[in-house]
Interface confidence: low
Amino acid sequence: HTAAQDNCTCPTNKMTVCSPDGPGGRCQCRALGSGMAVDCSTLTSKCLLLKARMSAPKNARTLVRPSEHALVDNDGLYDPDCDPEGRFKARQCNQTSVCWCVNSVGVRRTDKGDLSLRCDELVRTHHILIDLRHRPTAGAFNHSDLDAELRRLFRERYRLHPKFVAAVHYEQPTIQIELRQNTSQKAAGDVDIGDAAYYFERDIKGESLFQGRGGLDLRVRGEPLQVERTLIYYLDEIPPKFSMKRLTA
């Protein structure tokens, strides 16, 4: 009798193939697209998730004003190159040899160039601002209840250490969640804020990445919190390098 489970699946990533060929006959899972072994006790890196997604069949006062250097992911989906640890490679290129530099969450941070473009290092996204607008409710949510529920969600569902949830702002109907995680703060085993934000984004869109779990059912004191739009801003440790043409557009 081996330690393999009957239901050999990956709870934290449905975009995997699993078989009981790990040590002791236990379940081991590999990400679709890359074939990389993944750690199913925690979140899979955004790079591997994007790669798996691309390989799948196609069918005001208290609110934070995003910095002028904040990035929004306007480029949408692409098939990324991931390093052996599952992180984004600093330089990404498409099939037509168009290349660009990305940050640690895979968002473009330079103008597009050709194969001669150099991206010296993977710049860390250390501050993520998740901007949500919730559907109308009878009254505003209690701020402290909302704060506690969102912190609980990131701690329990995404296993993000509470110290990385810097703040939760609320000015009906806008909710802002600030995640902060410097390179020096992130210890081995800590979930990356970029990965947590991506799982949250997919949950909010009703596209949960968790295996077999129901979709996200967010409630504050029993009252459903339904999100009607999401914007995510990414701030890097080094400001992005775009030409003036783009900045004035």
Epitope: H1, A3, A4, Q5, D6, N7, C8, T9, C10, P11, T12, G22, P23, G24, R26, C27, Q28, C29, A37, V38, D39, C40, S41, A188, G189, G212, R213
Partner: antibody, heavy 119, light 112 residues
Framework: QVQLQESGPGLVKPSETLSLTCTVS????????VNWIRQPPGKGLEWIGV???????NYNSALMSRVTISVDTSKNQFSLKLSSVTAADTAMYYC?????????????WGQGTLVTVSS | DIVMTQSPDSLAVSLGERATINCKSS????????????LAWYQQKPGQPPKLLIY???SRESGVPDRFSGSGSGTDFTLTISSLQAEDVAVYYC????????FGGGTKVEIK
């Protein structure tokens, strides 16, 4: 929140079968495995066995011939049966939830129930 | 079966000083696929169930003070308490989960 609670008779006679129940709440029995661990008075921890989320079981090879772990999903209960007990089976018995797909760690434990084997 | 050997059996350390506990496994606990070591550390205080401190050999469980750290790979592992506090008096156990589960014999940490 996640909770586990062991229950059962505190006293069992030698050669009889020890039967304990672990009642769980706050999580799905089909998503997590539950382990049984025991600790004789003043001694260390000994893993007894596990029922994986899929329903299969594994046992400590030293106890395998005497142990059975089962589940009653309608009652959210796991049970442990240890046959032909002796004084050496006197211990605090804990149930603990697997915190991982392959059971790498136990983050949630019951408070334990003390079982004494004596005539 | 994998055998886990802890040393020392007991340890007396002054408040604020470093405490180091060793754990040795009879075979490697490193999964080359996921590059993870299947080793956890637990703390048990009298009359209480064990509490998870460290998993994957070096990952600190949420809420565990950062004075606790785990290190090592393969067959040799260490739990370090960088600055012992009064509330750290307890028995500490390592546990392998590479092939089913085995606990080490425990190390009792006391104040000198």
């Amino acid at each position: 929140q996640v909770q586990l609670q062991e229950s059962g008779p505190g006293l069992v006679k030698p050669s009889e079968t020890l039967s304990l129940t672990c009642t769980v709440s706050g999580f799905s029995l089909t998503s997590y495995g539950v382990n049984w661990i025991r600790q004789p008075p003043g001694k260390g921890l000994e893993w007894i066995g596990v029922m994986w989320a899929g329903g299969s079981t594994n046992y400590n090879s030293a106890l395998m011939s005497r142990v059975t772990i089962s589940v009653d999903t309608s009652k959210n209960q796991f049970s442990l049966k240890l046959s032909s007990v002796t004084a050496a089976d006197t211990a605090m018995y804990y149930c603990a939830r697997d915190e991982n797909w392959d059971g790498a760690w136990f983050a949630y434990w019951g408070q334990g129930t003390l079982v004494t084997v004596s005539s | 079966d994998i055998v886990m050997t802890q040393s020392p059996d007991s340890l007396a350390v002054s408040l604020g000083e470093r405490a180091t506990i060793n754990c040795k496994s009879s075979q490697s606990l490193l999964n080359s696929g996921t590059r993870k070591n299947y080793l956890a550390w637990y703390q048990q205080k009298p009359g209480q169930p064990p509490k998870l401190l460290i998993y994957w050999a070096s990952s600190r469980e949420s809420g565990v003070p950062d004075r606790f750290s785990g290190s090592g790979s393969g067959t040799d592992f260490t739990l370090t308490i960088s600055s012992l506090q009064a509330e750290d008096v307890a028995v500490y156990y390592c546990k392998q989960s590479y092939n089913l589960f085995t606990f080490g014999g425990g190390t009792k940490v006391e104040i000198k």
